[in-house]
């Protein structure tokens, strides 16, 4: 359930605060990498590799680091100020409407269509009609209609952190 809450979900109204690390809150807020103590008088550091906070905040605890699922690779580890960045393995992608899992990219386009976009960690291959150039709906084609192609190489890492 760690993915259910990010600091964006919990973020209070953003207030400007001086950008230096302090052991006591500045204007009631603690710097990234810290949370506020129960009595509101101290800033307590998050535990490296366990939890984090990304903004100046008055959260009473740090947020849990995301653990990359099987089928994902860790692009960058969790630090006290940044959540783990996970990315789908080559040949798989994560859609916006189903962010909880990586799905296999299609291996090719349906008959009468050409591939114009490779498989990336955040998108399936993109197909368009040969004549009209209009995009395919994204439905997985029947096997016998498939024109095979190899999955593309990720163009750039996709940050999924909060």
């Amino acid at each position: 359930e760690s993915a259910l809450i990010t600091q964006q979900d919990l973020a209070p109204q953003q207030r400007a605060a001086p950008q230096q690390k302090r052991s006591s809150p500045s204007e009631g807020l603690c710097p990234p990498g810290h949370h506020i103590s129960e009595d509101g008088r101290d800033c307590i550091s998050c535990k490296y590799g366990q939890d984090y906070s990304t903004h100046w905040n008055d959260l009473l605890f740090c947020l849990r680091c995301t653990r990359c699922d099987s089928g994902e690779v860790e692009l960058s580890p969790c630090t006290t100020t940044r959540n783990t960045v996970c990315q789908c393995e080559e040949g798989t992608f994560r859609e916006e409407d189903s962010p909880e899992m990586c799905r296999k990219c299609r291996t090719g386009c349906p008959r009468g269509m050409v591939k114009v976009g490779d498989c990336t960690p955040w998108s399936d291959i993109e197909c368009v009609h040969k004549e009209s150039g209009t995009k395919h709906s994204g439905e997985v084609p029947a096997v016998e209609e498939t024109v095979t192609s190899s999955p593309g190489t990720p163009a750039s890492p996709c940050s999924l952190s909060g």
């Epitope: 259910l4 009595d39 605890f61």
Partner: antibody
Framework: EVQLVQSGAEVKKPGASVKVSCKAS????????MNWMKQSPGKSLEWIGR????????FYNQKFKGKATLTVDKSTSTAHMELSSLRSEDTAVYFC???????????????WGQGTLVTVSS | DIVMTQSPLSLPVTPGEPASISCRSS???????????LHWYLQKPGQSPQLLIY???NRFSGVPDRFSGSGSGTDFTLKISRVEAEDVGVYYC?????????FGPGTKVEIK
């Protein structure tokens, strides 16, 4: 609509334990602390402590450490408070109440359960 | 622990008339961050408490504007501009500046 629905009244003998529950609905259960308060007959309110459903942390009023144990079942969005080694002075109505995860807005309870009367009598 | 006191402990009121409840704390409730964490609740007969005012003067959603809170330091006041029959019950002040959070003894408001 935010609702906190508590379990029914209990009658227990001295030395026994009791577990009171508080089922939350109408909001993200892991998005708020769940607090517990005690109201002795004809008396004021005392804050017992709170549970963080997000990470499992508890924070107790020192007075109730060893007396109350707070837990939750995230699968049913239910908070529990177990009171052990019951004595007559534990006879009270116990309330659950929701509070925010932030210091600045976390010290008051915006929604309360209806209360559970626990009677300790031999 | 911070001790909260309220006065009066019992307050007979006439509908349509104003009412005022005082709350005092044994120490200042001004936090080092500059905010004051003093709140008011109403417990109607046979019900659970309900939040009226938070942080001295902020009305909780749905609370009628006849309720107002004021004060600073150790002295606070809840005012009802025109009491209605539905306002009867016990009013509690509460502080969350200092751990543990504590409540006042309550003020019972009843119709004369």
């Amino acid at each position: 609509e935010v609702q906190l629905v508590q379990s029914g009244a209990e009658v227990k003998k001295p030395g026994a334990s009791v577990k009171v529950s508080c089922k939350a609905s109408g909001y993200s259960f892991i998005g708020y602390f769940m607090n517990w308060m005690k109201q002795s007959p004809g008396k004021s309110l005392e804050w017992i402590g709170r549970f963080n459903p997000y990470n499992g942390d508890t924070f107790y009023n020192q007075k109730f450490k060893g007396k109350a144990t707070l837990t939750v079942d995230k699968s049913t969005s239910t908070a529990h408070m177990e009171l052990s080694s019951l004595r007559s002075e534990d006879t009270a109505v116990y309330f659950c109440g929701r509070s925010a995860y932030y210091f600045d807005s976390g010290g008051y309870f915006d929604y309360w359960g209806q209360g559970t009367l626990v009677t300790v009598s031999s | 622990d911070i001790v909260m006191t309220q006065s009066p402990l019992s307050l007979p009121v006439t509908p349509g008339e104003p009412a005022s409840i005082s709350c005092r704390s044994s120490q200042s409730l001004v936090h080092s961050n500059g905010n004051t964490y003093l709140h008011w609740y109403l417990q109607k007969p046979g019900q659970s408490p309900q939040l009226l005012i938070y942080k001295v003067s902020n009305r909780f959603s749905g609370v009628p504007d006849r309720f107002s809170g004021s004060g600073s330091g150790t002295d606070f006041t809840l005012k009802i501009s025109r009491v209605e029959a539905e306002d009867v019950g016990v009013y509690y002040c509460s502080q969350s500046t200092h751990v543990p959070w504590t409540f006042g003894p309550g003020t019972k408001v009843e119709i004369k």
